[in-house]
Interface confidence: medium
């Protein structure tokens, strides 16, 4: 069975800190999925911010940027410049 | 507590191989993530990466080094052995072992060093 | 072969502020994350800063990292004769398979 799991259950972020976010993939290969990021806000609302390669949600690809991690079997996700607006929590996925 | 430790001969030939073995504990390397790497420094001079491996016995080695190197694992002992043939007296330098961050690319944990000196 | 660029010496007085810099390229710093090391004379190198900017327990709050596009900076304040050591920067480069690589060094000099 495929498992991610995430580095921290909690980030605490500075403004205009670039921060970084990891999943670990584990039982399978990361190469051999697209991984995906989401963000879950206070009204419970999933919003699409990242899926392989180079796609973005509306508004998202300026201040973040994803990638994968082959060597370690990460999905990462990075916020450049992080504001209040970025809070919230995040959540990795994968799929074929 | 994470030590690792570094051993092998102090001294080598010109043209001989040299095989150092790392004896690590506190972590194990069948532990997802977790990696163990070797970095050499010539007497006075900057840190070089020589050769990496993981616990899903994936290898990295230095490009400018390769063909000379050889990195394996032996879970059941804790141990990381390096390998390293045709020595010269330009490889003379301390050899550290040190273990990888378990979700990033940086050295967290440090053996001492050895020394090997090459030379007839 | 060395693919970062950090200056060879930095020195300040006692209680003042030094920085030293880490020149990469898009394919090392650009793309990965930096980490710093210092080495006090006779031993092992210690990780300082890790991930650009995060220390691990135990490294005081003197010590600062940040990272802007292909340059990385490591930043000492409160400078004290303890940390009269070599500094190394450090990353990985993905630009073929993984390798990792490290800075020249810099020895910074309490005067």
């Known amino acids: 069975a495929i498992e991610l799991v995430p580095e921290h259950q909690t980030v605490p972020v500075s403004i205009g800190v670039p921060a970084t976010l990891r999943c670990s993939m584990k039982g399978e290969a990361i190469g051999n999925y697209y991984i995906n990021w989401y963000r879950k806000t206070q009204g419970n609302t999933m919003t699409f911010i990242y899926r392989e390669k180079d796609i973005y949600g509306p508004g998202f690809k300026d201040n973040f940027q994803g990638d994968i991690d082959i060597a370690k079997n990460l999905a990462v996700l990075k916020i450049l410049a992080p504001s209040e607006r970025d809070e919230g929590s995040y959540y990795c996925a994968c799929d074929t | 507590q994470v030590t690792l430790k570094e051993s092998g001969p102090t001294l080598v030939k010109p043209t001989q191989t040299l095989t150092l073995t790392c004896t690590f504990s506190?972590?194990?390397?069948?532990?997802?993530?977790?990696?163990v790497g070797w970095i050499r420094q010539p007497p006075r001079k900057a840190l070089e990466w020589l050769a990496l491996?993981?616990?899903?016995?994936?290898?990295h080695y230095s490009p400018s080094l390769k063909s000379r190197l050889t990195i394996t694992k032996d879970t059941s002992k804790n141990q990381v052995v390096l390998t390293m043939t045709h020595m010269d007296p330009v490889d003379t330098a301390t050899y550290y072992c040190?273990?990888?961050?378990?979700?990033?690319?940086?050295?967290?944990?440090w053996g001492q060093g050895t020394l090997v000196t090459v030379s007839s | 072969q060395l693919v970062l660029t950090q200056p060879p010496s930095v020195s300040a007085a006692p209680g003042q502020k030094v920085t030293i810099s880490c020149s990469g390229s898009s394919s090392n710093i650009g793309n990965n994350d930096v980490s710093w090391y210092q080495q006090l004379p006779g031993t092992a190198p210690k990780l300082l800063i890790y991930?650009?900017?995060r220390r691990p327990s135990g490294i005081p709050d003197r010590f600062s990292g940040s990272k802007s596009g292909t340059s990385a900076t490591l930043g000492i304040t409160g400078l004290q004769t303890g940390d009269e050591a070599d500094y190394y920067c450090e990353t990985w480069d993905s630009s073929l398979s993984a390798i990792w690589v490290f800075g020249g060094g810099t020895k910074v000099t309490v005067l």
């Open positions: 040190a273990h990888e961050g378990d979700w990033g690319h940086y050295f967290d944990f």
């Open positions: 506190g972590f194990s390397l069948t532990t997802h993530g977790v990696g």
């Open positions: 991930d650009n900017n």
């Open positions: 491996i993981y616990w899903n016995a994936d290898k």
